[in-house]
Interface confidence: low
Amino acid sequence: VTGSRVYPANEVTLLDSRSVQGELGWIASPLEGGWEEVSIMDEKNTPIRTYQVCNVMEPSQNNWLRTDWITREGAQRVYIEIKFTLRDCNSLPGVMGTCKETFNLYYYESDNDKERFIRENQFVKIDTIAADESFTQVDIGDRIMKLNTEIRDVGPLSKKGFYLAFQDVGACIALVSVRVFYKKCPLTVRNLAQFPDTITGADTSSLVEVRGSCVNNSEEKDVPKMYCGADGEWLVPIGNCLCNAGHEERSGECQACKIGYYKALSTDATCAKCPPHSYSVWEGATSCTCDRGFFRADNDAASMPCTRPPSAPLNLISNVNETSVNLEWSSPQNTGGRQDISYNVVCKKCGAGDPSKCRPCGSGVHYTPQQNGLKTTKVSITDLLAHTNYTFEIWAVNGVSKYNPNPDQSVSVTVTTNQAAPSSIALVQAKEVTRYSVALAWLEPDRPNGVILEYEVKYYEKDQNERSYRIVRTAARNTDIKGLNPLTSYVFHVRARTAAGYGDFSEPLEVTTNTVPSRIIGDGANST
């Protein structure tokens, strides 16, 4: 039965003579006259089992003391700590040269835990032990004892266990404590990696490389390794683990971020408070949820505040210049907390009679500098149709506008472009040709660009080649040209006029009047 004594964490005790209750019962040779088990009292009046020998008067002493079998427990090297008191030979009266101030320490490896006798030739010498000059004075009961402590090591060991032996060659000595232990590097956590109990190597300079395992809720950054030194101390840690997302290092552990905090990545940073306009409702959050009406763009870092779409632009002003419109506006009152605001222009062409019937303007309209993604608060729109109702919407957008289910970030203005000269008339037809007259009809211009006030028909005899022409004006899209010469080729041009002026003449229509009183009906541009 052994009592509990406290030793360094890196030492595993295999034998401690001071922890044994009752007699030690080690084997001595000779059985009498050599080593003797004696109980003395320590400072707490507790008995200590010691072995003493003081055969200093007789020469050629050879007294052996052997321990019980000691299990190796996987250790390749063990340490023997001996606390002893040894008297100076000079302090012993009448002792001649036979007195010694040393004793010898031996060991013998064996798989047999029941060997009854000491066979000296089986034992291997570890060292000769002498009293150190520096000793600890310990109060043992009513006496001050000069207590020396010596530690030796032995290895590599390979059998299941071993015996220790002490050889006295003529000293006056008391073994107060014998402790046998091996060294381990104790379980430890360094840089969030746990390193297991590791028995030291076989020799005093060996290093045992040990790979650590990351503590719960952490992952390797660099492979965590340490070396277990022969003295049972961990040497130079390499690599480390990092707390997983949603966890931070606290007291050497990776603990979940508290509610209201988060950590997005596996780093050595601590959990951060949720950014503005966001929250976390569980421990271990890797990101925070945006408040209602607030959003986070795809490329927004988890550390950025949640933001919302901007409000509508303000103070939209339009300036119409013929078929161009310049629009200018002010930034929204609320940018949603973002810097990436831009503007999109939506152009709609609306009917004069029913302004609600609008349709997109199409690709013919041009925007300067651009239609979408405007960074400035003005735009110039050109190539519009004249005398047309347009509605322009200016949309304020930012990185989270696309997440908004109820957009209300636009301001609009409706304008009518100025009248302009009409386009040319595409088709002029001779509907009826007689000897003295031609009945003409035509279509309205593709782009009237305003209210058509009248049409102007210019005609001349072909061989006169426009040196002498006549003009007829009409509000209708047809007219009868009378007073022509029979059997004569005439060229006709038609153009339209709005308040803004005349358009271009149509392509020439060539018609030849008849020689007989009959009528000729023609649709072609060059009736003959």
Epitope: P186, N191, V236, D268, A269
Partner: antibody, heavy 121, light 106 residues
């Protein structure tokens, strides 16, 4: 007792080399790493790196690669710092220090007395 | 690399007074921090390792605390032999020293 003994002051010309020894005694030389620390005149301490006395494997701090070499002679329990192509800005006291690593933390628990290297033309 | 910033640069105290020195890391070094004392013309001396563990032979008037990024060295009652420069040093990632705090007689 445990101690580290360094050589006396050195005066070198720019471009020359210097080899600073650090002899250990009083403990098992190969049980502790050896660190090197620089201190320019009137300045603070700068960690240069360390060498594993078991394997001879050196680790250099930023700014101390190339011209600086750590080496060992375990038979005489001595670590060396060699600096080549010396520059005026290498003028400093160079310390060796034993690295003690325990369960509770690391520290340089035993220091040499330092070697002053002066680089001057 | 991790930068250690010590404050104040100079601390003036009278013998018997309490001295508090600060060391702040640019990122967490856990408890991987040591404190050293250096007197003029001498090599540095290890005072504290593991952020708070006194080295062998260091008087108990020296104490230290902190972890992560903020660390403190306290001398409870300054003795005449304590006037020196004090350095913090981290070994969490590579090794670096602070720029030092000089403790001088007031």
């Amino acid at each position: 007792q445990v101690q580290l003994l360094q050589s006396g002051a050195e005066v070198k010309k720019p471009g020359a080399s210097v080899k600073v020894p650090c002899k250990a005694s009083g403990y098992t030389f190969t049980s502790y790493a050896m660190s090197w620390v620089r201190q320019a005149p009137g300045q603070g301490l700068e960690w240069m790196g360390w060498i594993n006395t078991n394997t001879g494997n050196p680790t250099y701090a930023q700014g101390f690669t190339g011209r600086f070499v750590f080496s060992l002679d375990t038979s005489v329990s001595t670590a060396y710092l060699q600096i080549s192509s010396l520059k005026a800005e290498d003028t400093a006291v160079y310390y060796c220090a034993r690295v003690r690593t325990t369960v509770y933390g690391d520290g340089m628990d035993v220091w040499g007395q330092g070697t002053l290297v002066t680089v001057s033309s | 690399e991790i930068v250690l910033t010590q404050s104040p640069a100079t601390l003036s105290v009278s013998p018997g007074e309490r001295a508090t020195l600060s060391c702040r890391a640019s990122q967490s070094v856990s408890s991987n921090l040591a404190w050293y004392q250096q007197k003029p013309g001498q090599a540095p001396r290890l005072l504290i390792y593991g952020a708070s563990t006194r080295a062998t032979g260091i008087p108990d008037r020296f104490s230290a605390s902190g972890s992560g990024t903020d660390f403190t060295l306290t001398i409870s009652r300054v003795e005449p032999e304590d006037f020196a420069v004090y350095y913090c040093q981290q070994y969490g990632s590579s090794w670096t020293f602070g720029q030092g705090t000089k403790v001088e007689i007031k």
